[in-house]
């Protein structure tokens, strides 16, 4: 089997003139292409991988939301020579007619990394953007994290920074098939220069309170009380995007082989994230679970 092979990291790495053709190893009978896009309120970028795949032919499309950071994934596996150059690598959704609404700044500034390399997104070197509220979405937190796409034995990753709807999330993430968007949120202007080591303590979690020992009396002493929280408290998100399927056929999981030295594969569903807020609202972060390893 021959497949197109390329890697795109917010550049034109998968443009027609940069794609190569590779011969797959014996026993590999699918070509794969995976595209992941991230949109902040200040812009969007995409990652893409094409190459020899594993598993069965099929197509998968998913929309995810992480505190107002939107992520969209498309996966396609096919069993013909050079069949893996069908997916759009950038958004084609926006109608050119109409003007983008103007939003006044809400007073918060964040570092913004939208398609920047890891080198360009270090510390305080990225550009600073003014956050704003859009419709009933309030963007008063700053985010520092990463997006990772794994397919065809290749893992690509880019940093993500920008304005979000949560000021206190810690090492939070959403996952789709072969895709992860994760990071932490913070409160205050330009607080997102580096949140890699952020701990779970936040103003919303009450501290451990030590009560003084009771005064000695003739009556048997009562048990002293301590208060603590057994788990981090996640603030409730108030809004979610209603991310529509891209294909008229049933959306099934598409299996991808993760890079050998990377994390285990994330296949077919929201593998690593349970939304602990807004249960019953849709879509749940990560979208509906998909059957594992089914063809379309």
């Amino acid at each position: 089997l021959e497949c197109y092979s390329c890697v795109q990291k917010a550049d034109d790495g998968c443009s027609p003139n940069k794609m190569k053709t590779v011969k797959c190893a014996p026993g590999v009978d699918v070509c794969t292409e995976a595209v992941g896009a991230v949109e902040t309120i200040h812009g969007q970028f995409s990652l893409a991988v094409r190459g020899c795949g594993s598993g069965l032919p099929g197509k998968n499309d998913r929309g995810l939301d992480l505190h107002g950071l939107l992520a969209f994934i498309q996966l396609q596996q096919c069993a013909q020579d050079r069949c893996n150059a069908k997916l759009n690598l950038t958004s084609r959704a926006l109608d050119p007619a109409g003007n983008e609404s103007a939003y006044p700044p809400n007073g918060v500034e964040c570092y913004s990394c939208v398609g920047l390399s890891r080198e360009a997104c270090q510390g305080t070197s990225p550009p600073v953007v003014s956050c704003y509220n859009a419709s009933d979405h309030v963007y008063k937190g700053c985010f520092d994290g990463n997006v990772t796409l794994t397919a065809a034995n290749v893992t690509v990753s880019l940093p993500v920074r920008g304005c979000v709807q949560d000021e206190f999330c810690t090492r939070d993430g959403v996952t789709g098939p072969g895709f992860t968007l994760s990071g932490s949120c913070c409160q205050g202007s330009r607080c997102n220069s580096d949140l890699r080591n952020k701990t779970y303590f936040s103003p919303r979690i009450p501290p451990l309170v030590r009560l003084p020992p009771p005064e000695p009396t003739t009556v048997a002493s009562t048990t002293s009380v301590t208060t603590s929280t057994s788990a981090p408290v996640r603030p409730t998100s108030t809004t979610k995007p209603m991310p529509a399927p891209t294909s008229q056929t049933p959306r099934q999981g598409v299996e991808h082989e993760a890079s050998r030295d990377e994390e285990p594969r994330l296949t077919g569903g929201a593998a690593g994230h349970q939304d602990r807020s807004n249960s019953g609202q849709y879509p749940a972060k990560g979208g509906p679970q998909q059957p594992h390893n089914k063809g379309c």
Partner: nanobody, 117 residues
């Protein structure tokens, strides 16, 4: 599949108001853009307004300041609040949703808005 059902159309006098609703059902897991379009006889469908998943909105120049698009995710519903209606707003209004990549979109059946004295 995604199904869209509009409601709220009707006849109203110039200067009046109407609120259109569009209930979205089915597999909504990758909807990115939700919008309202309108069409008058013999003309092409034109964008009225759309709203992205992160709340950002776009409006046609002709309705800016008079119409407001919003969405209630808990009710799976898209709205269009139309104020200061004019005769030229008379049209069939269609709800539209599409995915981020633009490779799939769905339309409602339309609801008629008539602005006349």
């Amino acid at each position: 599949q995604v199904q869209l059902l509009e409601s709220g159309g009707g006849k109203v006098q110039p200067g009046g108001s109407l609120r259109l609703s569009c209930v979205v059902s089915g597999d909504t897991s990758s909807i990115y853009l939700m919008g309202w379009y309108r069409q008058t006889p013999g003309k092409q469908r034109e964008l009225v307004a759309h709203i992205r998943g992160n709340g950002r909105t776009n409006y046609a120049d002709s309705v800016k300041g008079r119409f407001t698009i919003s969405r209630d995710n808990s009710k799976n519903t898209l709205y269009l609040q139309m104020n200061s209606l004019r005769a030229e707003d008379t049209a069939v209004y269609y709800c539209n949703v599409r995915n981020f990549w633009g490779s799939a979109e769905y339309w409602g059946q339309g609801t008629l808005v008539t602005v006349s004295s």
